[in-house]
């Protein structure tokens, strides 16, 4: 009876999410493997988040709006492990917008989700950021490693969206 009511709840939750995400990929987790954590297909998952790499070339503001429509934000990178996971799926000759910007050019960087900007957990390439006119951050491959660079926000780039996993 307990399992039946849990399944019914899950199905109704799935139906609820289906209007936003036509397909979800779910895995069982939790100590009794009773919880399902899901990401929209074909997003990838890492820890408690889902990631989507957009190959559409758009300005930073348009990229953020595009993520927002999908219930996400441009990616906020909190750890080196998270960055290493993300970069596995990136092309080394491309650049991708992050959810990091400095709209006034005062070198006051801010994450789109209001996560505090911690200078100790940043992965800028050597010599970056280097221009107050370049107010948006990308991740790209340079000098044999992935790192961040400040660029003009209006110049179209690919982008990475991030959202919290859906638990059902």
């Amino acid at each position: 009876n307990f399992m039946y009511s849990k399944t019914v709840k899950r199905l109704s939750k799935l139906q609820e999410y289906q209007q936003y995400y036509p397909s979800l990929t779910c895995v069982m987790e939790g100590k009794d493997m009773e919880d399902w954590s899901c990401c929209p297909t074909p997003w990838t998952s890492f820890q408690s988040s889902c990631y989507f790499i957009s190959t559409v070339m758009q300005s930073w503001t348009k990229s953020q709006n595009n993520c927002s429509v999908m219930g996400a934000d441009l990616v906020v990178i909190n750890t080196k492990e998270e960055q290493d996971f993300i970069t596995q799926n990136l092309k080394i000759n491309s650049a991708y917008f992050l959810g990091l910007s400095d709209p006034k050019g005062w070198r006051h960087w801010q994450w789109v989700d209001q996560t505090p900007y911690n200078k100790n957990v940043t992965f800028w390439h050597s010599g970056e950021p280097n221009s107050p006119d370049e107010r948006c951050a990308i991740i790209n491959f340079r000098s044999e490693e992935w790192g961040w660079n400040d660029v003009h926000c209006h110049v179209p780039q690919k982008s990475i969206c991030k959202m919290k996993k859906i638990y059902i």
Epitope: T61, K62, S101, D133, V155
Partner: antibody, heavy 121, light 111 residues
Framework: EVQLVESGGGLVKPGGSLRLSCAAS????????MSWVRQAPGKRLEWVST????????YYPDSVKGRFTISRDNAKNSLYLQMNSLRAEDTAVYYC??????????????WGQGTTVTVSS | DIVLTQSPDSLAVSLGERATINCRAS??????????MHWYQQKPGQPPKLLIY???NLESGVPDRFSGSGSGTDFTLTISSLQAEDVAVYFC?????????FGGGTKVEIK
């Protein structure tokens, strides 16, 4: 006082080339992105190209891509536009303009007086 | 590309009266509190001159009879009390994404 002075315009046959120059004074030229904007008779203003302050970024609309090249010489406080394979539709007054960044975008705060390019056989 | 449509194409206003020019973008040129539309004035035989940046910020040296407002896709330039020297063509411009684009212009004349 900020000044932008364009030169190099003139009459050229279709398929020909011209090099426009813009001499800048009254400001620290190397610190600013610069653009060329044109205005054909009776038409709206049309952006032609942009170059970033550090020369790392250039951008063109499809209408001129592959034919026009923007460049700058910060030592000479000069901006250039090399125009090849010119067409009748390139006929316009060409302005050089200084860019000022504002939040996620930019505007043009100073414009030169313009130089006229006429493409005709 | 973002298309900017200005209205009206031309406007005749009596001296001392209010002139209102509209600019509509084909998609939003705002992001959160940033409204990325700018306005220019162009007199015959002269280059454009910046009046308003960021939808509502008056450029230094521009008389305060000029003002701007709007957000998203709809923006307005207002001349509160038209003076003879305001006879010109007025353009809006966006640069939230490349390529930057301009409106078709509104010609302001004296009635």
């Amino acid at each position: 006082e900020v000044q932008l002075v364009e030169s190099g315009g003139g009459l050229v046959k279709p398929g020909g080339s011209l090099r426009l120059s813009c001499a800048a004074s009254g400001f620290t030229f190397r610190s600013y992105g610069m653009s060329w904007v044109r205005q054909a008779p009776g038409k709206r203003l049309e952006w032609v190209s942009t170059i970033s302050s550090g020369d790392s970024y250039t951008y063109y609309p499809d209408s001129v891509k592959g034919r026009f090249t923007i460049s700058r010489d910060n030592a000479k406080n000069s901006l250039y536009l090399q125009m090849n394979s010119l067409r009748a539709e390139d006929t316009a007054v060409y302005y050089c303009a200084r860019q000022i960044y504002y939040d996620y975008a930019y505007y043009f705060d100073f414009w030169g007086q313009g130089t006229t390019v006429t493409v005709s056989s | 590309d973002i298309v900017l449509t200005q209205s009206p194409d031309s406007l005749a206003v009596s001296l001392g009266e209010r002139a209102t020019i509209n600019c509509r973008a084909s998609e939003s040129v705002s992001f959160r509190t940033s409204h990325l539309m700018h306005w220019y004035q162009q007199k015959p035989g002269q280059p454009p001159k910046l009046l308003i940046y960021g939808a509502s910020n008056l450029e230094s040296g521009v008389p305060d009879r000029f003002s701007g407002s709007g957000s998203g896709t709809d923006f307005t330039l207002t001349i509160s009390s038209l003076q003879a020297e305001d006879v010109a063509v007025y353009f809006c411009q966006q640069s939230i994404e490349d390529p930057p684009t301009f409106g078709g212009g509104t010609k302001v004349e004296i009635k």
